[in-house]
């Protein structure tokens, strides 16, 4: 029988009743153009919602945008247009969102051709009230808050000037000209790119990297001969032109820019790329491009400096510079990554790591699912997943996969079962355990949201026609009951819950069509009715994380530790409620090669757990250039796994010899770097 | 082989306490939940609470909770139950037992290895 | 807490005869539900878990099913060995709790 439909479903009582009660229609008095939203603040309530309608006329467009409020999760909503005296806002820019719960926002309007600058709506109060502000430049990107400190903003011009405010845009101060991209770093540091010649694109391989540790009363330029930039986890990033060809490569510094290292990756031509994939204060993960138009290239992973890279995995599907990956951070459960790879005969197949990069391999077949017609052997075949690359497609896939932090162990993702990714209309299945196991959830596409930390699923099936139902499941996904919401379908547009999935409220969005008119929807149901009572300790079950043999003394050892979690038995309709913390209980494991990469001048046979030398490298003394000095390496093999936390059992001897002299990487070591001031 | 090796048979007056211990071998003492169970003369089983031994958390049943105290120590592979305030209804054989697992999940799948039994008796 | 109601509460059968025993939970437990066998005087040992997944060692005569509240046992051709104690056991729900026992009696 299909999921959920088996005679075991306990059903949850008289739901109908309580969902009817908890049920709230908005209908927005606007005409159907586009619609955006976003949640201010976390645990607010608070919605804004901007509806824009553009009408062509022969000479120019006419646009009129409309700004809602909501602050009860999207139960209803009070238009508040006059408080931004009902300007034209820049969809283009969204809207600003202060970090964490500042209650910041900043609107971009629309300004008539001839004018100064731009202007800009600011609230400090979570949309309540509005300051017009007119800005001495035109915008070329949305405001971007600093993470440390929600009064201070930066923002490019049209003219390539970067500007900043310290008082949350009541003034502005260009503090720098020719400017190409800019990014916050960590303690209100700014990096940025700038050009000397021509421009952004002219000067490509040639721009200057600079950094503002004030924002603009002094500078340092902290590489030159540079590409591109960026910043990921505790490490600086730049790509860096070589002296002598078109080639550049990867330069890394964990030390705001001060001093550099030439990471030991392979160097790019013109028409490849890096990209960081993922990083976080440990490690990250780089993509490297092929040569040539081949959509696929090289995961390296790094060690903790960032500077030393393992070969991840091969053939990783990655169109082009900006383009598709599928790469995904599956954020329920620690060290997992899903994604995709194009194999020698052009198939798409997924492949998951679940300790960090460290070993991929294809995802298990659901146990209710039959091979499709792209295996060979129909008894043998994976799951494959579908993603961004999808997506792009014009596959019938609605959603990428969907994990989150606070529903442990839980991924949701659209798929096939053959080998390899089929373009026939995929299913929806579910992992409760970070991937390593996988059922099939629901027949054909959907969308779908957690809400509650995992106590409640919520999905709509992906349709052309109208819609009026919609499916949750209180047992992560095995049993799924159906709610008609309204009389009247509507054309679904999107979902929406608060992020986090701690909210108990789901918003529906679509439009009405009549013969004449078109109008904005939105229906939202909050579920707190149907998990009428607080969970409590008899509701939650032990879990270890990444167990494969509860016989093996090592079980659920992942980077040097394991974890146990109280999880939300299947059984409990209860909620978890929005103060809910994941109970985690760590465990030290006992070292074993495992939890060693392969040192500088070392690497890993196929299907083995030893280091073995470099052939090229073989003895040779190990000497590099490190911080702008060259070091000598002494070493067996083998460095420990960034993050790893094992302590005892194996233990190589690594020792790192400053030899003294100086060396410079291809980039400017510490004492050339210039300093100027405003 | 995986068994449980429970201490001996204890005699004890109304309103004593007592302490059962249960070592654990052949597997890993942390991986897995330990159960009490009771049996009284005659009659069925009961079931008391659990430990996890990774952990130390435990879960016991209500009619138990505030009289009943589980530890362990991992260092030797022992878990341990306590009974306090002891009264005649308390005379019975308690057993540890090990709760099955199904890979991450700890608990659902019964109880696989069964200690060999603590007689109890509770007598003025 | 969940009530485990057990039918018979003691049986008489001949070997070879084929055995049916019952067990009712008072609430939905899923597949959470386990049975052992008792011996006089020795622990109970466990027969079947997650309602009818055998436990490795026990021999194939001995049958679990069912989902929800009902559950049967079945032991499919006696053997002397098989005269015993039989309790189920819902894990779904804390606390846990056993039926209260089905007597397996010669006949």
């Known amino acids: 029988s299909a999921p959920g439909e088996d005679e075991e479903c306990g059903r949850v009582r008289d739901f109908v009743a309580k969902l009817a009660n908890n049920t709230h229609q908005h209908v927005f008095d606007d005409l159907r153009g586009s619609v955006s939203l976003s949640w201010v603040g976390d645990s607010t309530g608070v919605i804004l919602v901007l509806t824009t309608f553009h009408v062509p006329l022969v000479i120019m467009t006419f646009g009129q945008s409309k700004l809602y409020r909501s602050e009860d999760y999207g139960k209803n909503f009070k238009d508040i247009t006059d408080l931004i005296n009902n300007t034209f806002i820049r969809t283009e820019f969204g809207m600003a969102i202060g970090p964490e719960n500042s209650g910041k926002v900043v609107l971009t309007a629309e300004v008539s051709g001839g004018s100064r600058g731009g202007r800009i709506f600011r609230s400090s109060d979570f949309a309540k009230n509005f300051v017009q502000t007119d800005l001495p430049f035109h915008p070329l990107t949305q405001m971007m808050y600093s993470p440390q400190n929600s009064d201070y903003l930066l923002a490019l011009s049209t003219e390539n000037g970067l500007w900043v405010s310290k008082n949350f845009g009541g003034k502005w101060e260009e503090i720098h000209k020719a400017v190409c991209l800019a990014k916050w770093g960590s303690d209100n540091t700014i990096f940025f790119t700038t050009y000397a010649n021509g421009s952004c694109k002219a000067d490509l391989g040639a721009l200057e990297l600079w950094r503002t540790s004030d924002l603009g009363k002094s500078f340092k330029t902290i590489g030159v001969k540079i590409y591109s930039f960026g910043l990921g986890g505790r490490f600086l990033f730049a790509s860096v032109m070589a002296d002598k060809d078109t080639t550049r490569r990867i330069h890394v510094s964990t030390d705001q820019g001060d001093t550099w290292s030439m990471a030991q990756l392979p160097s790019v031509g013109q028409e490849q790329f890096y990209s960081i994939l993922a990083a976080n204060d440990d490690m990250v993960f780089m993509h490297v491009d092929e040569p040539g138009d081949t959509g696929f290239g090289t995961i390296f992973t790094s060690d903790d400096r960032g500077i030393v890279y393992s070969k991840s995995l091969d053939r990783h599907l990655y169109t082009t510079t900006g383009g598709e990956t599928d790469f995904t951070n599956v954020t329920s459960l620690r060290g997992v990554y899903i994604t995709s790879v194009l194999s020698e005969d052009n198939s798409i197949q997924t492949m998951i790591t679940f300790d960090q990069g460290g070993r991929w391999t294809h995802l298990r077949k659901p146990e209710n699912s039959e091979c499709d017609a792209t295996a060979k052997n129909k008894n043998e075949c994976s799951l494959h997943i579908h993603a961004s690359y999808s997506i792009s497609q014009k596959l019938n896939v609605p959603m990428a996969p969907l994990s989150e932090p606070n529903a442990v162990g839980i991924v949701i993702a659209h798929g096939s079962v053959g080998d390899a990714i089929s373009v026939m209309v995929p299913d929806v299945y579910i992992s409760d355990d970070g991937g390593y196991s996988w059922t099939k959830m629901l027949e054909g596409p959907h969308y779908y949201t957690i809400l509650d930390s995992g106590g409640i699923i919520v999905a709509i099936e992906h349709s052309s026609r109208p819609i009026n139902v919609i499916k949750f499941s209180t047992d992560e996904g095995q049993c799924w009951q159906t709610y008609t919401f309204t009389r009247d379908p509507i054309y679904f547009t999107g979902l929406a819950s608060e992020p986090g999935a701690r909210s108990m409220n789901i918003s529906i969005w679509g439009f009405t069509e009549s013969f004449l008119t078109s109008q904005w929807v939105s229906y939202t149901i909050d579920f707190k009715d149907i998990l009428e009572r607080n969970c409590e300790e008899k509701d939650y079950t032990i879990w270890l994380a990444h167990s494969t043999d509860p016989e093996d003394y090592e079980d659920g050892c992942i980077l040097g530790y394991k974890e146990q979690f109280l999880r939300l038995r299947k059984s409990s309709v209860c909620q978890n409620g929005r103060d809910y913390v994941v109970t985690k209980q760590p465990s030290i494991c006992l070292c074993s090669l495992e939890d060693f990469l392969c040192d500088f001048g070392y690497y890993r046979p196929e299907n083995d757990s030893k280091c073995v030398e470099q052939p090229e490298l073989k003895g040779h003394d190990l000497e590099f250039c490190l911080y702008g000095r060259e070091e000598h390496l002494t070493t067996n093999g083998y460095r420990k796994i960034p993050g790893d936390k094992c302590q005892g059992g194996v233990n190589p001897v690594r020792e790192v010899k400053d030899l003294k002299k100086k060396c410079t990487s291809n980039f400017l070591s510490p004492e050339k770097q210039n300093s100027k001031s405003n | 082989q995986v068994q449980l090796v429970q201490s001996g048979a204890e005699v004890k007056k109304p309103g004593a306490s007592v302490k059962v211990s249960c070592k654990a071998s052949?597997?890993?003492?942390?991986?897995?939940?330990m159960h009490w169970v009771r049996q009284a003369p005659g009659q069925g089983l009961e079931w008391m609470g659990w430990?996890?031994?990774?952990?130390?958390?435990?879960r016991y049943a209500q009619k138990f909770q505030g009289r009943v105290t589980m530890t362990r120590d991992t260092s030797i592979s022992t878990a341990y139950m306590e009974l306090s305030r002891l009264r005649s209804d308390d005379t019975a054989v308690y057993y540890c037992?090990?709760?099955?697992?199904?890979?991450?999940?700890?608990?659902?799948?019964?109880?696989?290895?069964w200690g060999q039994g603590t007689t109890v008796t509770v007598s003025s | 807490d969940i009530q485990m109601t057990q039918s018979p509460s003691s049986l008489s059968a001949s070997v070879g005869d084929r055995v049916t025993i019952t067990c009712r939970a008072s609430q939905s437990i899923s597949s959470y539900l386990n049975w052992y066998q008792q011996k006089p005087g020795k622990a109970p040992k466990l027969l079947i878990y997650?309602?009818?997944s055998l436990q490795s060692g026990v021999p194939s005569r001995f049958s679990g099913s069912g989902s929800g509240t009902d559950f049967t046992l079945t032991i499919s051709s006696l053997q002397p060995e098989d005269f015993a104690t039989y309790y189920c056991q819902q894990s779904d729900v804390s606390p846990i709790t056993f039926g209260g026992g089905t007597k397996v009696e010669i006949k």
């Open positions: 997650a309602a009818s």
């Open positions: 430990i996890n031994p990774m952990s130390g958390g435990t």
């Open positions: 037992a090990r709760g099955k697992r199904s890979s991450g999940w700890y608990e659902g799948y019964g109880m696989d290895v």
């Open positions: 052949g597997y890993t003492f942390g991986g897995y939940l």
